[in-house]
């Protein structure tokens, strides 16, 4: 048993790191590996992750880590039985891949302006909270060219756009994103999609 | 809720040995490490050693050789004990629990106030 | 072993005033520093960890900054039930305290 692809971890930079790798062979991963984790530099205990299937040779394991500071950094040992496969280390403040986004809200009430909030998946005592910045990806249902993204470079949660931007009487969604400068990290995953018809009073023609 | 409850003698003769017994509640001895801390008005507080989740023990170099924790997770208990004693370690013993990664301590047991004299 | 130099020793201070506490490292500990109150005759209390996060159930007037070597403790207004002593600690290995900080009612 080897490893074919090594270790690559993330860290959501608040209690999960999630660590991925590839088995050179399909591998029951949860029942003959095991990787072990421990900060380094501190008085700590080594704890393990069971990891579970990705793929027919894929393994991937959530290490939980109940909070992050920019120093931290992990010692990984990959084992199968007695049989140490792989050794490695993890500074989760380098490798942050921050929460998705939540609660996407399309509000449409507010004269022919739609506002589009969401949450900040951070509570505000996290690092991340304030260092934040978004991607809202909008798109039409009906009509795949329909396609554009807009970028959120101020901390609040939220965008307004004129509904006369997008065609109306059609279907659009709607998803948002995040990113943090400061720590260079790479986007969050999508949040869930929310949908909503687009309609608006055309201006009245004056001759 | 969280209680960590500490028993042991008050009073031991120099040379002989302490062992404080601390009784866990509200959580599992297999989720959490046990420290104990010592006080004194002589040295302050002092750091012993810590039983961790998974058994495995990290004593202060200074008190290694005297010191032993284990535990039993069905009576969630923790035993501390402490050979040869002397005046100097007169002070007060806590087990404290430790939160989550960081060896910090959330919840501390009562102490157990220990005198050496003869 | 890493040192820690907690100052002042003893401060007095009223009721609504602002006080900080001091604590030095002798070596680079990163943000691994926590602090503790204690009241007399009773058990430490966490108050702050990773140098600035507040421990759960502490109020929002107590405040921990610093890293590398220097960090304080700030209480901002002070109430009554905040008099006694403080002590940082430091999580590398070996842990070890600081030699406290007694706040005492002016």
């Known amino acids: 048993m080897k490893v074919l692809q090594e270790p690559t971890c993330v860290s959501d930079y608040m209690s999960i790191s999630t660590c991925e790798w590839k088995m050179n062979g399909p591998t029951n991963c949860s029942t003959e590996l095991r990787l072990l984790y421990q900060l380094v530099f501190l008085l700590s205990e080594a704890h393990t992750c069971i990891p579970e299937n990705n793929g027919g040779a894929g393994c991937v394991c959530h290490l939980l880590m109940d909070d992050v500071v920019s120093a931290d950094n992990y010692t990984l040992d990959l084992w199968a039985g007695q049989q140490l496969l792989w050794k490695g280390s993890f500074k989760p403040s380098e490798h942050v891949k921050p929460r998705a986004p939540g609660n996407l809200t399309v509000h449409t009430n507010v004269s022919d302006t739609l506002l589009l909030t969401w949450s900040n998946p951070y509570p505000p005592d996290n690092y991340l909270y304030n260092h934040l910045t978004y991607a809202v990806n909008i798109w039409s249902e009906n009509d795949p060219a329909d396609f554009r993204i807009y970028n959120v470079t101020y901390l609040e949660p939220s965008l307004r756009i004129a509904a006369s931007t997008l065609k109306s009487g059609i279907s659009y969604r709607a998803r948002v994103r995040a990113w943090a400068q400061c720590y260079n990290t790479t986007w969050s995953e999508w949040s869930p999609s929310t949908k909503w018809h687009n309609s608006y009073r055309e201006p009245f023609e004056q001759h | 809720q969280v209680q960590l409850k500490q028993s042991g003698p008050g009073l031991v003769q120099p040379s002989q040995s302490l062992s404080v017994t601390c009784t866990v509640s509200?959580?599992?001895?297999?989720?959490?490490?046990v420290h104990w801390v010592r006080q004194s008005p002589g040295k302050g507080l002092e750091w012993l050693g810590v039983?961790?989740?998974?058994?495995?023990?990290d004593y202060n170099a200074a008190f290694k050789s005297r010191l032993s924790i284990s535990k039993d997770n069905s009576k969630s208990q923790v035993f501390f004990k402490m050979n040869s004693l002397q005046a100097d370690d007169t002070a007060i013993y806590y087990c404290?629990?430790?939160?989550?990664?960081?060896?910090?301590?959330?919840?501390w047991g009562q102490g157990t106030t220990l005198t050496v004299s003869s | 072993d890493i040192q820690m130099t907690q100052s002042p020793a003893s401060l007095s201070a009223s009721v609504g005033e602002t006080v900080t506490i001091t604590c030095r490292a002798s070596?680079?500990?990163?943000?691994?520093l926590a602090w503790y109150q204690q009241k007399q005759g009773k058990s430490p209390q966490l108050l702050v960890y990773?140098?600035?996060t507040l421990a759960e159930g502490v109020p929002s007037r107590f405040s921990g900054s610093g890293s590398g070597t220097q960090f304080s403790l700030k209480i901002n207004s002070l109430q009554p039930e905040d008099f006694g002593s403080y002590y940082c600690?430091?999580?590398?290995?070996?842990?070890?305290f600081g030699a406290g900080t007694k706040l005492e009612v002016k």
């Open positions: 070596e680079n500990i990163y943000s691994y």
């Open positions: 509200g959580f599992s001895l297999t989720n959490y490490g």
């Open positions: 039983i961790w989740s998974g058994g495995s023990t």
């Open positions: 404290a629990r430790n939160k989550g990664t960081r060896p910090v301590f959330d919840y």
């Open positions: 990773n140098a600035k």
């Open positions: 600690q430091h999580y590398v290995s070996p842990l070890t």
